[in-house]
């Protein structure tokens, strides 16, 4: 059996973040059992976790991971140097910042060391797999009697991120949401002083520096409203 490695030729669906290849399945021997899919996420461009479902194996197997970057100066095959484990079985690999090259095609290969012919190769666009840390330091400023401005910080370059702000009052059953671009500022023009408001924000590595689909975690919520401090009506930020 020969391993098939898919090399993109420009005609693939470039919206896909990975291409998957595996061994031909012309028989049901151990060597042709499909390997689990590897999922990689780059956290705030600080480190990357590539994980797989180790429990999908018919018997506990310490699968090994190799990686390289296609058509680049970093095309030398590298072994995983920091495995992640689930119940003492390999279930992932963690790569550090210096090993992450966002705009080169990342090739990851999973292999069964007991059956070297049993392997699967995926190609990933890492810039589409970045998940930033949640926004921090939410603050509210009262711009006028009825207008609030929400600000926040991110632990990444602002211009690489877009944001989603959600807010609601204690009287609302659902959140109202608003998209915010890299300027990361949100104004609520009409605030009812009799209601208590809750705001939260999440961020995404899109569209300038990548095309990630996954959002960060939500920020801690921040509150404003009828039971807030009367001492300074122009600046009040209370974290839950």
């Amino acid at each position: 059996l020969n391993t098939t490695i898919l090399t993109p030729n420009g005609n693939e669906d470039t919206t896909a973040d990975f291409f998957l290849t595996t061994m031909p399945t012309d028989s049901l021997s151990v060597s042709t059992l499909p390997l689990p899919e590897v999922q990689c996420f780059v956290f705030n461009v600080e480190y990357m976790n590539c994980t797989w479902n180790s429990s999908s194996e018919p018997q506990p197997t310490n699968l090994t991971l190799h990686y390289w970057y296609k058509n680049s100066d970093n095309d030398k095959v590298q072994k995983c140097s920091h495995y992640l484990f689930s119940e003492e079985i390999t279930s992932g690999c963690q790569l550090q910042k210096k090993e992450i090259h966002l705009y080169q095609t990342f090739v990851v290969q999973l292999q069964d060391p007991r059956e070297p012919r049993r392997q699967a190769t995926q190609m990933l666009k890492l810039q589409n797999l970045v998940i930033p840390w949640a926004p921090e330091n939410l603050t509210l400023h009262k711009l006028s009697e009825s207008q609030l401005e929400l600000n926040w910080n991110n632990r990444f370059l602002n211009h690489c991120l877009e944001h989603l702000v959600q807010y609601r009052t204690d009287w609302d059953h659902s959140w109202t949401e608003q998209s915010v671009d890299y300027r990361h500022k949100f104004s609520l023009p009409s605030v009812d002083g009799q209601k208590r408001y809750t705001f939260r924000v999440r961020s995404r590595f899109n569209p300038l520096c990548g095309s990630a689909q996954h959002w960060s975690e939500w920020s801690h919520p921040i509150h404003w409203g009828s039971n807030t401090s009367k001492e300074n009506p122009f600046l009040f930020a209370l974290e839950a």
Epitope: V45, L102, Y103, Q104, L157, H159, C160, P207, L208, C209
Partner: nanobody, 117 residues
Framework: QVQLQESGGGLVQPGGSLRLSCAAS????????MTWARQAPGKGLEWVST????????AYAASVEGRFTISRDNAKSTLYLQLNSLKTEDTAMYYC??????????PGQGTQVTVSS
């Protein structure tokens, strides 16, 4: 190796215009976002603008928004920055960098923009 060659700077009066260019080689230009940054005399490197790899998205520092326009020609591996309504505070050395401007890729030699009457 990566090479970035900026050009197009010069001396211009306030309110004037310039078009900066950056010729790139040694990497797959069309795969990378590209960034312009600048350094005024005695100051640190300041991010100016970034453009997505396909040119479809752009971002600008508040100080230049509405006056500067970033663009790119992937077929020519060239990055541009159109500077309009120039102010004296725009005087700086302008650099293009590969990527989103995180400070890690070394910029090129730069091109000097001087705004003075």
């Amino acid at each position: 190796q990566v090479q970035l060659q900026e050009s197009g700077g010069g001396l211009v009066q306030p309110g004037g215009s310039l078009r900066l260019s950056c010729a790139a080689s040694g990497f797959t230009f069309s795969s990378y976002p590209m960034t312009w940054a600048r350094q005024a005399p005695g100051k640190g490197l300041e991010w100016v603008s970034t453009i997505a790899s396909d040119g479809g998205s752009t971002a600008y520092a508040a100080s230049v928004e509405g006056r500067f326009t970033i663009s790119r020609d992937n077929a020519k591996s060239t990055l541009y920055l159109q500077l309009n309504s120039l102010k004296t505070e725009d005087t700086a050395m302008y650099y293009c960098t590969k990527g989103y401007g995180d400070g890690t890729p070394a910029p090129g030699q730069g091109t000097q923009v001087t705004v003075s009457s």
